[in-house]
Structure formats: structure tokens, C-alpha cells
């Protein structure tokens, strides 16, 4: 659970009230607009040396990582999960997020993505699991068996507001980001827009929904006139390099 991640995490501090209650499970009391996105979970201590980063879901990890128990089968100490390095081409997998960018999980193996038929979230996953396959057929290796694609199916990329699995599912100018309990395509941030600066790459921690990253040529930096603000309230915006 999210609680076990918090208990075992030294990287998270100053947890704001809305996530402090309800067992770390935000409820309907949290209602925010894009201009004032809830920033819970992005106030981290600097990690001088790399240490395993606790997580609850894949999107809390970097783009080249996924969230899992340190050893498959063992739930880890108290069920703790950490960010692990993504699996390269031809390595075994159980879901898309385990595979490194540019690959997806097919037949329990990380395979290169063919974007002409890579699914966008809203399009049914039969695109990669194939039409008419038997979802009850157990694979011999313990992974779900997926049938081989016999034809390419062309689909437009997800527009803003579309459910997605990863950013490659979204149209240009959009990224795939958490939105409460789903992930949807959201606009990549423009110059001057408020961004979320994570102390460690990919540490999306406890955000109930994420912003995209800053667009090309932009970096997420402390806004000039906010340098004097306290550490916990520094405003970051997308600025030219």
C-alpha cells in the first residue's frame, strides 16, 4: 500500500495535510485545477548517493525504470517496492512498463515498439494482444501468453484527455501522466507554465496527478522572484535553457 511506501521512505518529508489523512488515499476532498496542481510528494531530501527509491506504481519511477519488489515472488521487506532498471530488448516482462523506452511487453518478452500499431490507451489492447486471443490460456513460463500480430492496425495517437499507458500513446505535444487513478494524455508544458521539479529523476512520489515535463528547449527552474521563498514553497516554471 501507499502507507508502507511512506513508512519505509526516508526520501519524503513535509507531507502536506491532504495526503496525511485517509491512509494516504486521497479522496474527493481533493479538487484542484491545472493552474494550482496539488504538489504533494515533490518535496524530497537530496539523495547524495543512489539508494533504492520506494514506489507504489511505475509512473513514480524514471522513464527507464519500473516499480517492483526487489526479487520477484518475494514481496520484499514488509511488501516494499522499489524502482528497478527497465528491461532491455528480449528480456522477460509482465507488463509494458517493465520494458525500456521504445519497447513493449509481448509474449512475456520486451520487444521493439512498432508505432504504426502501438496502442493508445483508449484503443482496445487487442491491438497488441491481438484480436480473438484466448486470455485464459496460461503460458508455460508463467507469463500471460499473447498471440503474434498478423497484421498492422493503424490508429491515431491519443489526444488531450485520452487514457494512455505511456507517452508514446499520445499525440505530439502531449505526454502520458497520472490523473488520479488513471493516466491520460496531457499537454507538454510551455514557457512560463508552472512545472514540478523532482529532486530525483522520475520521483513523482505522491502526486495525485502529474504535470507533463517542460517542452523542448525549456527547463524546470525556480522562478526568479521566488528565490527568497521558503524551500517548501518555491515555484518552479518552465524557462529557456
Amino acid at each position: 500500500t501507499l502507507n508502507s511506501v511512506l513508512i519505509n521512505s526516508n526520501a519524503i518529508k513535509n507531507l502536506p495535510p491532504p495526503l496525511g489523512g485517509a491512509g494516504g488515499q486521497p479522496g474527493s476532498a481533493v479538487s484542484v485545477a491545472p493552474g494550482v496542481l496539488y504538489e504533494g510528494g515533490n518535496k524530497y531530501q537530496t539523495l547524495d548517493n543512489y539508494q533504492p527509491y520506494p514506489c507504489a506504481e511505475d509512473e513514480e519511477c524514471g522513464s527507464d525504470e519500473y516499480c517492483s519488489s526487489p526479487s520477484r515472488g518475494a514481496a520484499g521487506v514488509g511488501g516494499v517496492q522499489i524502482c528497478l532498471a527497465c528491461r532491455k530488448r528480449r528480456k522477460r516482462c509482465m507488463r509494458h512498463a517493465m520494458c525500456c523506452p521504445g519497447n513493449y511487453c509481448k509474449n512475456g518478452i520486451c520487444m521493439p515498439s512498432d508505432h504504426s500499431h502501438f496502442p493508445r490507451g483508449e484503443i482496445e489492447e487487442s491491438i497488441i494482444e491481438n484480436l480473438g486471443n484466448d486470455h485464459n490460456a496460461a503460458a508455460g513460463d508463467g507469463y500471460p501468453r499473447r498471440t503474434t500480430l498478423t497484421s498492422k492496425i493503424y490508429h491515431t495517437k491519443g489526444q488531450e484527455g485520452s487514457v494512455c499507458l505511456r507517452s508514446s500513446d499520445c499525440a505530439a505535444g502531449l505526454c502520458c501522466a497520472r490523473h488520479f487513478w488513471s493516466k491520460i494524455c496531457k499537454p507538454v508544458l510551455k514557457e512560463g507554465q508552472v512545472c514540478t521539479k523532482h529532486k530525483r529523476k522520475g520521483s513523482h512520489g505522491l502526486e495525485i496527478f502529474q504535470r507533463c515535463y517542460c517542452g523542448e528547449g525549456l527547463a524546470c527552474r525556480i522562478q526568479k522572484d521566488h528565490h527568497q521563498a521558503s524551500n517548501s514553497s518555491r515555484l518552479h516554471t518552465c524557462q529557456r535553457h
Epitope: 500500500t1 507488463r95 487513478w181 488513471s182 491520460i184
Partner: antibody, heavy 115, light 108 residues
């Protein structure tokens, strides 16, 4: 094709409990957040609860918070809604649906809370 | 909470006519996080439009969604007999997710 099948509904007395199940098939279950929505007889739709793909994040409407618990078993491709301290106003058809905008729905299961 | 108000409550039209359904949000949604559903008696709702204007898989081209901010519209360009039903809008910008009260499209 995507299929969601709810079960577990029925008649229960006020203060009682029920556990609804939603069996999913036709898609990679753990890739998707899931949602419970209800519809009182002759009324409109009301969001009840949502849960992320791994089950780590859960959300509830104020009307059910503290009484209902959403959970999922990804190894069984099943979504659950544990309903405790049921009230007459919880009487409704309960639907499970996929994602935050509900692209696929189950057929619904009727929960009647009455003495 | 964001309140979605649908109008009209009932729309009486004949097959072949154009239907225009309105959904107004009590707050600016900022992003197009709005969906439309169709529900027929005794059936579960069916997603028609998501992201304000994207047609869901298998939805006929006669259904289209538009709008932004607080005002959204579902248009059925030429009503077919099977289109007579109740239509709901839903926002997924903020929690709690909320639905409109519905518009019933009935045969005139």
C-alpha cells in the same frame, strides 16, 4: 473483446454489508485504473470510487468514504467493492467500469438496502 | 464540487433531425476532460465521447462533441431510431467525478 461482469448484489438490511465483485477479461487488467459508479432507481449516475492499476491509489466519493473499500486482485483480474454500514440511500445498480472516463461498463448489479 | 447542468431536460425530435445537447460546468474545466455517455432503459451507459471531442471506438460519425471551458455540446447530426435514449455528460478534471443530470432524447 473487453468484458466486465459484476456480481454480489442483493437485498441487505440497513447497517449490513455486501461485497461486490467485477470480473474483467479481454484486456491487460493491471494496466488500467478501474471505477465504480452507481445509479439509484430512476435517477442519474453517481461516481463511487476509483482505484489505480496496481491498487496502490484509491479514491472515494464523500458519500461512501469510511464505509466502502475498493480493492483489486490483479492475479484474478477482479475488482471489488466492500460495502459496510449500508444505508437506504445506497440502494442502486452498481456498475464497474474501466478508467477515469468509463470506456467499458459491466451490466450492473442491483443492491437493495431495506428493512 | 463541479456541477454539470444539462439542457434541455427532454428533447423531442424525429428521426433524421439534428439533436444538440448542452452541458454547462459550474467551474472552468481548463482542459477538455469531459465525456458523454448514452444510456438506454435497462442497459449500462455507453461511452460516446471523451476528451470533449474524441469519438470512442465504434461510435458512429453522426455523434460529435465540442466545447471548452464551461460550455460543452454533444451533437447528433441526423437521429437514427436507436439514438433515442438518455445522454449524460461527465467531467474528469477534478474529484469528485461528477455527471450531469441527463438529457432524454425522445421521439416526437
Amino acid at each position: 473483446q473487453v468484458q466486465l461482469v459484476e456480481s454480489g448484489g442483493g437485498l441487505v438490511q440497513p447497517g449490513g454489508s455486501l461485497r461486490l465483485s467485477c470480473a474483467a477479461s479481454g484486456f491487460t487488467f493491471n494496466n488500467y485504473g478501474m471505477t465504480w459508479v452507481r445509479q439509484a432507481p430512476g435517477k442519474g449516475l453517481e461516481w463511487v470510487s476509483g482505484i489505480s492499476g496496481s491498487g496502490s491509489y484509491t479514491y472515494y466519493a464523500d458519500s461512501v468514504k469510511g464505509r466502502f473499500t475498493i480493492s483489486r486482485d490483479n492475479s484474478k483480474n477482479t475488482l471489488y467493492l466492500q460495502m459496510n454500514s449500508l444505508r437506504a440511500e445506497d440502494t442502486a445498480v452498481y456498475y464497474c467500469a474501466r478508467t477515469i472516463y468509463m470506456d467499458y461498463w459491466g451490466q450492473g448489479t442491483l443492491v437493495t438496502v431495506s428493512s | 464540487d463541479i456541477v454539470l447542468t444539462q439542457s434541455p431536460a427532454t428533447l423531442s425530435l424525429s428521426p433524421g433531425e439534428r439533436a444538440t445537447l448542452s452541458c454547462r460546468a459550474s467551474q472552468n474545466l481548463f482542459s477538455p476532460y469531459l465525456a458523454w455517455y448514452q444510456q438506454k432503459p435497462g442497459q449500462a451507459p455507453r461511452l460516446l465521447i471523451y476528451g470533449a471531442s474524441n469519438r470512442a471506438t465504434g461510435v458512429p460519425a453522426r455523434f460529435s462533441g465540442s466545447g471548452s471551458g464551461t460550455d460543452f455540446t454533444l451533437t447528433i447530426s441526423s437521429l437514427e431510431p436507436e439514438d433515442f435514449a438518455v445522454y449524460y455528460c461527465q467531467q474528469y478534471m477534478t474529484l469528485p467525478l461528477t455527471f450531469g443530470q441527463g438529457t432524454k432524447v425522445e421521439i416526437n
